[in-house]
Interface confidence: medium
């Protein structure tokens, strides 16, 4: 690494992956192992995140970018940058402080994560319930009773919703 020549700030020429080493006359030195600098002109390198325990490494740390973690099977990420791993539940359940609990009557969860949410109220749209809801599935709304006739077409159940309110992994 060559010594920088900038008159304003000799550190400004140090690229990502290096730091401006004051102990070595402001030479651009490579980041030490297990550290990184994602932008140029840094006076220190940041320590790499370590993915331990329930976290597993999704992307290794490099000299220019931090490690990225996700969660081991049976857990899912929460929060910005997967700051927390939280256990999965079964469909028809949601996670509470005391573990996985079944959805209350009138609510459902079709995912292994997220929350129990109320069944759709078909009558609000002037429709009738074609298929009853369960803990795992929303109701399926069909035509209003007046619209039902021998030639009426069947209703395709809606696709499951995305996992509500959780960080994508």
């Amino acid at each position: 690494f060559e010594r920088t020549r900038s008159l304003q700030d000799p550190c400004s020429n140090c690229p990502a992956g290096t730091f401006c080493d004051n102990n070595r006359n402001q030479i651009c030195s490579p980041c030490p192992p297990n550290s990184f600098s994602s932008a140029g002109g840094q006076r220190t390198c940041d320590i790499c995140r370590q993915c331990k325990g329930v976290f597993r490494t999704r992307k290794e740390c490099s000299s220019t970018s931090n490690a990225e973690c996700d969660c081991t099977p049976g857990f899912h990420c929460l929060g910005a940058g997967c700051s927390m791993c939280e256990q999965d539940c079964k469909q028809g359940q949601e996670l509470t402080k005391k573990g996985c609990k079944d959805c209350c009557f009138g609510t459902f969860n079709d995912q292994k994560r997220g929350i129990c949410r109320p069944w759709t109220n078909c009558s609000l749209d002037g429709k009738s319930v074609l298929v009853n809801g369960t803990k795992e599935r929303d109701v399926v709304c069909g035509p209003s009773p007046a619209d039902l006739s021998p030639g009426a077409s069947s209703v395709t159940p809606p696709a499951p919703a995305r996992e509500p309110g959780h960080s994508p992994q």
Epitope: T96, K97, G106, I115, R117, A161, P164, G165, H166
Partner: antibody, heavy 120, light 110 residues
Framework: QMQLVQSGAEVKKPGESLKISCKGS????????IAWVRQMPGKGLEWMGM????????TYNPSFQGQVIISADKSINTAYLQWSSLKASDTAVYYC?????????????WGQGTLVTVSS | SSELTQDPAVSVALGQTVRITCQGD??????ASWYQQKPGQAPRLLMY???IRPSGIPDRFSGTDSGNTAFLTITGAQAEDEADYYC?????????????FGGGTKVTVL
């Protein structure tokens, strides 16, 4: 950079209508609830309701049901809060916030707030 | 629906420790989250889940809970910690994912 940017301050007269907005960027808008929170002058935070873009379902605080409409346009990553007939008591700062649920309820990012003033 | 109760105000000497409480039936089932709000600013998430701090939140903030009560502790309070603090959780008395806020606690640093 993840952020929620709200529309600017509004001054309205009682009986007028209003729609304020909250644009999300830097994340997958469809995967998170967007909530609206009211803060009247000198008072605390009140949850008004929220919208889940993944299936377009809205949940309201019973105190606000019928008073406001919460909606969103997923194509432009924007949520809305609207009134058909404002009252002086609607004067407040309104925040949008991104919510996620787990064994609790967390608002991890907030808009800067929109001040709505209703006065004759 | 249920509610979350906070003490309206507490004061703490600079560098000392203060504990803010939040009480409510929903906290038996769900974790609380905590927010700091300074005048003219939006709230900021301080703590969520089982004592999880978002990045950028100083480690002098910590959270614990016991039964139907959640606690936010500021250890070694700084002048910049003077603010309103709100707790938040889900409502257990409804089959909708309703949200509760406490009334807020004003923390004064002496």
């Amino acid at each position: 950079q993840m952020q929620l940017v709200q529309s600017g301050a509004e001054v309205k007269k009682p009986g007028e209508s209003l729609k304020i907005s909250c644009k999300g960027s830097g994340y997958n808008f469809t995967n998170y609830f967007i909530a609206w929170v009211r803060q009247m002058p000198g008072k605390g935070l009140e949850w008004m309701g929220m919208f889940y873009p993944g299936d377009s379902k809205t949940t309201y605080n019973p105190s606000f049901q019928g008073q406001v409409i919460i909606s969103a346009d997923k194509s432009i990553n924007t949520a809305y809060l609207q009134w058909s007939s404002l009252k002086a008591s609607d004067t407040a700062v309104y925040y949008c916030a991104r919510a996620f649920y787990a064994a609790g309820n967390y608002f991890d990012y907030w808009g800067q707030g929109t001040l709505v003033t209703v006065s004759s | 629906s249920s509610e979350l109760t906070q003490d309206p105000a507490v004061s703490v000497a600079l560098g000392q420790t203060v504990r803010i409480t939040c009480q409510g039936d929903s906290l038996r089932r769900y974790y609380a989250s905590w927010y700091q709000q300074k005048p003219g600013q939006a709230p900021r998430l301080l703590m969520y889940g089982k004592n999880i701090r978002p990045s950028g939140i100083p480690d002098r903030f910590s959270g614990t809970d016991s039964g139907n009560t959640a606690f936010l502790t500021i250890t070694g309070a700084q002048a910049e910690d003077e603010a309103d603090y709100y707790c938040n959780s889900r409502d257990t008395n409804a089959n909708q994912p309703l949200v509760l806020f406490g009334g807020g606690t004003k923390v004064t640093v002496l």
